[in-house]
């Protein structure tokens, strides 16, 4: 009668067994085994016993004993069961960002692994169970639905394979999948709200405005704000469930036209888009031109005004006849013009808005001198010793520059608080002298002595 | 009938060598494993190293690693065991085993000196 | 390396006498430990395997126990021929290992 020890193995795949062939009777003619496992003998004393050491075990096998006995043969198998953890366990991909609300369909595959019957597959929220079956297939593919809550959000969501070898007395091994990290998302229907100027100047800043209520998280959400192909750097805000983007916007003489104003909202996998169309106008101020803005007293001056081409201007509140961007007038320089300013407002329509813009000249009239008895009385009579201000004002453009000299030489000391003497009286020759001549005229002081009186 | 007999001990200088062979006979050397073991005067046993002959896995104990090594012929069904740089420390009566895990069979062993 | 310590070095017995010889492992070994019978001047002679189980040709008297690290090679009744020196040798990892040996001696 043959025999084998152990009559039943589970062993690691790749692993070695020890296997024991035994006969009841004392001179077995033949003892040994049938296996196409590569084996070795371990050399025992004695005729009815061998031990075989079976190695590189990869699949379950069933090695025979066999003996040759006076009373015939006989055969004893023993039953190789192989155990492997699965080589591959794996969730099958999908996309990070999920919306609330959506069905998840949460699939797992497992390659390999055996026993068959002692594996499990498991699905699992963090630590909480989903699903759990057993491993069918090759490979073995198990499913469970989600429905995707705000609460899910950050959820790490894998896939365990269990082979529980602890009736065999082994262990229970444990495979584990990469996590699926879970990003829940909401992003309402509503587009988000731009805020921004309908028109604006070429070489000027504006500053747009892009909020949205409603999302979550709303800290992953990205914001774009683009003008034509200009990227914006706006400065987010978040609220619990909104966000504002304020970003500057600086064009250029490039822009100049109708642009596409953007404003996309990014989360998850889906965006909210708005869209806004801003004219970039070019609209310098309007020119003030002036024959020349320096002229003698008398000379004939034409003032013109000048506007972009599309612009309506006044002059000095006088319209351009017929309305348009150019008007002028004409005048002949008087001393009363010197500092008088012709201010031309020009208006320009840009997309339904009127722009004003104003540009003012102002006009140099050169007169004079002048020198006359209002502002330089000729004749003075102060009492001696009281206290008095010549006074002489000459008037010009340029404003002139006034000697009063008595005998050539002594000066009246116009405009000064002198204590009058008898030094102080007599003719003085006053000059107004500038650039555009010179002019004169005599002023009298007497000087009433106390012993007149 | 399971027979091992060695043979090429002797005495050596310090820093010779000697090659040592095991003769079997009863058993096919493929079929099973190949030892040595020694045993210094008045002292225990010491693994020294194993083959498997059917495909020359060897395995040798750190005080040898390096100095022995040991081999087999199939044809002449004999394992050898090559010692060099010997020591005064592997003066031992040195004896080739048959099997794996234990050691069932012995030779009768052979005498290493090493001593100048 | 794992040590193998066998336990008494030497003792004394008479004929008759139950005689115990303990191995310790210094790590678990499961059942992979073999012990030997060396009488002088011969070649070292094979008693048990695995722990426990016996081989042929050498007498019932001789029996062996034991799990993990400690072990135990028992002689239920010596006789003159069992007058030599035990060695335990383990085979759980490479090297393979033997304890110092126990030397039995006539009382």
């Known amino acids: 009668q043959t025999s084998v020890s152990p009559s039943k193995v589970i062993l690691p795949r790749g692993g070695s067994v020890l296997v024991t062939c035994s006969t009841s009777c004392d001179q077995p003619k033949l003892l040994g085994i049938e296996t196409p496992l590569p084996k070795k003998e371990l050399l025992l004393p004695g005729n009815n016993r061998k031990v075989y050491e079976l190695s590189n075990v990869q699949e379950d096998s069933q090695p025979m004993c066999y003996s040759n006995c006076p009373d015939g043969q006989s055969t004893a198998k023993t039953f190789l069961t192989v155990y492997w953890t699965p080589e591959r366990v794996e969730l099958a991909p999908l996309p990070s960002w999920q919306p609330v609300g959506k069905n998840l369909t949460l699939r797992c595959q497992v390659e390999g692994g055996a026993p068959r019957a002692n594996l499990t597959v498991v699905l699992l929220r963090g630590e909480k169970e989903l699903k759990r079956e057993p491993a069918v297939g090759e490979p073995a593919e198990v499913t469970t639905t989600v429905l995707v809550r705000r609460d899910h959000h950050g959820a790490n969501f894998s896939c365990r394979t269990e082979l529980d070898l602890r009736p065999q007395g082994l262990e229970l091994f444990e495979n584990t999948s990469a996590p699926y990290q879970l990003q829940t998302f909401v992003l309402p229907a509503t587009p988000p709200q731009l805020v921004s100027p309908r028109v604006l100047e070429v070489d000027t800043q504006g500053t747009v405005v892009c909020s949205l209520d409603g999302l979550f998280p709303v800290s992953e959400a990205q914001v774009h704000l683009a003008l034509g192909d200009q990227r914006l750097n706006p400065t987010v805000t978040y609220g619990n469930d909104s966000f504002s983007a304020k970003a500057s916007v600086s064009v250029t003489a490039e822009d100049e036209g109708t642009q596409r104003l953007t404003c996309a909202v990014i989360l998850g996998n889906q965006s909210q888009e708005t869209l806004q169309t801003v004219t970039i106008y070019s609209f310098p101020a309007p020119n003030v031109i002036l024959t020349k803005p320096e002229v003698s007293e008398g000379t004939e001056v034409t003032v013109k005004c000048e506007a972009h081409p599309r612009a309506k201007v006044t002059l000095n509140g006088v319209p351009a006849q017929p309305l348009g961007p150019r008007a002028q007038l004409l005048l002949k320089a008087t001393p009363e013009d010197n500092g008088r300013s012709f201010s031309c407002s020009a208006t320009l329509e840009v997309a339904g808005q009127l722009i004003h813009k104003n540009q003012t000249r102002e006009l140099r009239v050169l007169y004079g001198p002048r020198l006359d008895e209002r502002d330089c009385p000729g004749n003075w009579t102060w009492p001696e010793n009281s206290q008095q201000t010549p006074m002489c004002q000459a008037w010009g453009n340029p404003l002139p520059e006034l000697k009063c000299l008595k005998d050539g030489t002594f000066p009246l000391p116009i405009g000064e608080s002198v204590t009058v003497t008898r030094d102080l009286e007599g003719t003085y020759l006053c000059r107004a002298r500038s650039t555009q001549g010179e002019v004169t005229r005599k002023v009298t002081v007497n000087v009433l002595s106390p012993r007149y009186e | 009938e399971v027979q091992l007999v060695e043979s090429g001990g002797g005495l050596v200088q310090p820093g010779g060598s000697l090659r040592l062979s095991c003769a079997a006979s009863?058993?096919?050397?493929?079929?099973?494993?190949i030892h040595w073991v020694r045993q210094a005067p008045g002292k225990g046993l010491e693994w020294v190293a194993r083959i498997d002959p059917a495909n020359d896995n060897t395995i040798y104990a750190d005080s040898v690693k390096g100095r022995f090594t040991i081999s087999s012929d199939d044809s002449k069904n004999t394992a050898y065991l090559q010692m060099n740089s010997l020591r005064a420390e592997d003066t031992a009566v040195y004896y080739c085993?048959?099997?794996?895990?234990?050691?069932?069979?012995w030779g009768q062993g052979t005498l290493v000196t090493v001593s100048s | 390396d794992i040590q193998m310590t066998q336990s008494p070095s030497s003792l004394s017995a008479s004929v008759g006498d139950r005689v115990t010889i303990t191995c310790r492992a210094s790590q678990s070994i499961s059942n992979n430990l073999h012990w030997y019978q060396q009488k002088p001047g011969k070649a070292p002679k094979l008693l048990i395997y695995?722990?426990?189980q016996s081989i042929s040709g050498v007498p019932s008297r001789f029996s062996g126990s034991g799990s993990g690290t400690d072990f135990t090679l028992t002689i239920s009744s010596l006789q003159p021929e069992d007058f030599a020196t035990y060695y335990c040798?383990?085979?759980?990892?490479?090297?393979?290992?033997f304890g110092q040996g126990t030397k039995v001696e006539i009382k």
């Open positions: 009863g058993f096919n050397i493929k079929d099973t494993y």
């Open positions: 695995h722990a426990s």
């Open positions: 040798q383990q085979s759980n990892s490479w090297p393979y290992t």
């Open positions: 085993t048959a099997s794996g895990y234990w050691f069932a069979y």
